[in-house]
Amino acid sequence: GCLTQLYENAFFRGGDVASMYTPNAQYCQMRCTFHPRCLLFSFLPASSINDMEKRFGCFLKDSVTGTLPKVHRTGAVSGHSLKQCGHQISACHRDIYKGVDMRGVNFNVSKVSSVEECQKRCTSNIRCQFFSYATQTFHKAEYRNNCLLKYSPGGTPTAIKVLSNVESGFSLKPCALSEIGCHMNIFQHLAFSDVDVARVLTPDAFVCRTICTYHPNCLFFTFYTNVWKIESQRNVCLLKTSESGTPSSSTPQENTISGYSLLTCKRTLPEPCHSKIYPGVDFGGEELNVTFVKGVNVCQETCTKMIRCQFFTYSLLPEDCKEEKCKCFLRLSMDGSPTRIAYGTQGSSGYSLRLCNTGDNSVCTTKTSTRIVGGTNSSWGEWPWQVSLQVKLTAQRHLCGGSLIGHQWVLTAAHCFDGLPLQDVWRIYSGILNLSDITKDTPFSQIKEIIIHQNYKVSEGNHDIALIKLQAPLNYTEFQKPICLPSKGDTSTIYTNCWVTGWGFSKEKGEIQNILQKVNIPLVTNEECQKRYQDYKITQRMVCAGYKEGGKDACKGDSGGPLVCKHNGMWRLVGITSWGEGCARREQPGVYTKVAEYMDWILEKTQSSDGKAQMQSPA
């Protein structure tokens, strides 16, 4: 299953499959997730080691048993790959690292006014993988405001150095935020020239294209079909690059297919997995296990659940079958692709779905009438769980926020439905940033069921929580995916990085905002909160957040939206925007429904019809 816990001051011994430099443990974990054989990782922050060569070292590890012995190492951070973790799987990494210079091949330098502008330039450059920016206070005046665009053979820095007044980060192309745009077309009977960066075997051009998209240096590809004239080159997928970023030439060639990486696509990237099953095809590789199962789909599920399995072949040969079950061969290789692809067989083959963003689970948990005042504009994909609950009567308007917690579930505030309990009048918009982008053609979700907490009473602040079941499940993308829920009764975690988002009023007597707003607000203890609200009962099922001096808060139109906190690199839904005295007033914190206190209720209500809780437990 999915394991998200990080181990502080611990280092996994042995099992090394690759090593690289990464700026933090989260980026190291992401590289582990996307490495075909990595199950575990260990990271050495600069503070944890004197050896300059090992600082920022990220060590990717494999283990037949799925675990390795942990040794104590002060400052080290270790953890698991996020394979099998559904919507948490993403190659997108937005963080900017202050005081750090990520080294690589510098291929472009320009003057810019901010690190954000530098990151934008990197994201809009086809070859840029990461960047460094010298701030205005950099010690050498001639380098100030320099934006260095960089790449490296592996897509990670060749070295990372601690350097004052330098800020570094990665391209946001994997966040589907590139302005370059992409070529979706593939070209039949055409071969591209230029430099081959890798060679893998794939069953079709679309798998080849997805592998190219997630390979750090692939810009385009050529695939040789299974009827290519040279037998030894059939099903070969050549991943390619060039200095210019485009093929310098192409040759008409029967039975070849060429195309481009989709990394520069805006708004949608292909999932980093291959879900199609190929009948009449055998995938060769190292044998991991052989099991008897009923049907090729069960074989694929078995492969997906066995974390080391990369691909499989389900044999229909009479000697491989008994009764209704046949042999399911679970296999792996060094690069995650079959070492041999054979056609005309009595089998069906396919890949593990361990890197698919869309698990079957409906709700994500972890084991362990109120715009935002004083906020700033959010950017695309920053809060992909945020939804807008809108009512269509004669006109259509935004009324509340909400949080996507599963393919078919939204969590919001009960008071959003005061006087509007009819599910037909509601439209739920997900994956949006600007309300003005909504037109009559914008897709929306309709409500199948509104589940208001049984103890909620209109115009009371208690139990202000409601679940919405959508009529149809949503697909997950970089701009539309769920927020994880806290564990039941989560009281031990100290959250220090919490944000509230919404399109609500920017002042008490304001109006709904166009661009989704965000504000960083500290949590306030319930005792402190109770002092500020002497006329109300602040229960343990509420959580408060705000600045003593006011100025930043949720407001009308933010109700039902999320209060999220980042802990160990993972966002969790800590609160649901509920109520407060005015907006952003001094010593009047916002009051939020404490999600951890309602976990039993959420789990009970989101259970599937067959009685299984549709929950994902990444830890």
Epitope: Y224, V227, P270, S275, L316, Y343
Partner: antibody, heavy 120, light 107 residues
């Protein structure tokens, strides 16, 4: 020239049998997935059956399972559809088509179709 | 089985118009979606495969987009020869189902 040519259609009584053939030319028949698709008068396209290159893997629509058998003779470059226990609802134009290689399993080459009428 | 739902089922348009036909799959099919054109008494003709790639010989006024469950076929500048029935078809998993068709007729 790449071509598919169906034959064997005609009028048959309910419960009867018919064997359709599809002769391929102009391409390496043995390397391609082949399918049968049918179209009832005035209706849409309905996928009937598929056979993968060696003939080892075949699949059928639920509506014909147990009654129809797809096969191929790679040495003769010919695709077959054996239709038994025919019913009135099997009345349609039957097309054979070739699956694309290495791309989307789309059907890029189609025959002109052969009419099957099941009536008493 | 994966169900394919096309809309609209029929459509009236004039030469020069821009026409959009949509196709929705009952579950995600990645980009394994193909579009065909069929004229009365003729076999279907492949227009687009893999959701967006034009089959060779097909005019560039035809384009396709989408991934996952929602797909569109766009004809940007309708020509007299484009009046026909259009079908989407998924090639993600057997049975390789077709949509019910969209009949494009002259207004």
């Amino acid at each position: 020239e790449v071509q598919l040519l169906e034959s064997g259609g005609g009028l048959v009584q309910p419960g009867g049998s018919l064997r359709l053939s599809c002769a391929a030319s102009g391409f390496t028949f043995s390397a391609y997935m082949m399918i049968w698709v049918r179209q009832a008068p005035g209706k849409g396209l309905e996928w009937v059956s598929v056979i993968y290159p060696s003939g080892g893997v075949t699949m059928y629509a639920d509506s014909v399972k147990g009654r129809f058998t797809i096969s191929r003779d790679n040495s003769k470059n010919t695709l077959y559809l054996q239709m038994n226990s025919l019913r009135a609802e099997d009345t349609a134009v039957y097309y054979c088509a070739r699956g694309t290689v290495g791309a989307s399993d789309a059907f890029d080459i189609w025959g002109q179709g052969t009419m099957v009428t099941v009536s008493s | 089985d994966i169900q394919m739902t096309q809309s609209p089922s029929s459509l009236s348009a004039s030469v020069g118009d821009r026409v959009i036909i949509t196709c929705r799959a009952s579950r995600s099919i990645a980009t394994y979606l193909n579009w065909y054109q069929q004229k009365p008494g003729k076999a279907p003709n492949l227009l687009i495969f893999g959701a967006s790639t034009l089959q060779s010989g097909v005019p560039s006024r035809f384009s396709g987009s989408g991934s996952g469950t929602d797909f569109t076929l766009t004809i940007s500048d309708l020509q007299p020869e484009d009046f026909a029935t259009y079908y989407c078809q998924q090639s993600f998993s057997d049975p390789y189902t077709f949509g019910q068709g969209t009949n494009l007729e002259m207004k």
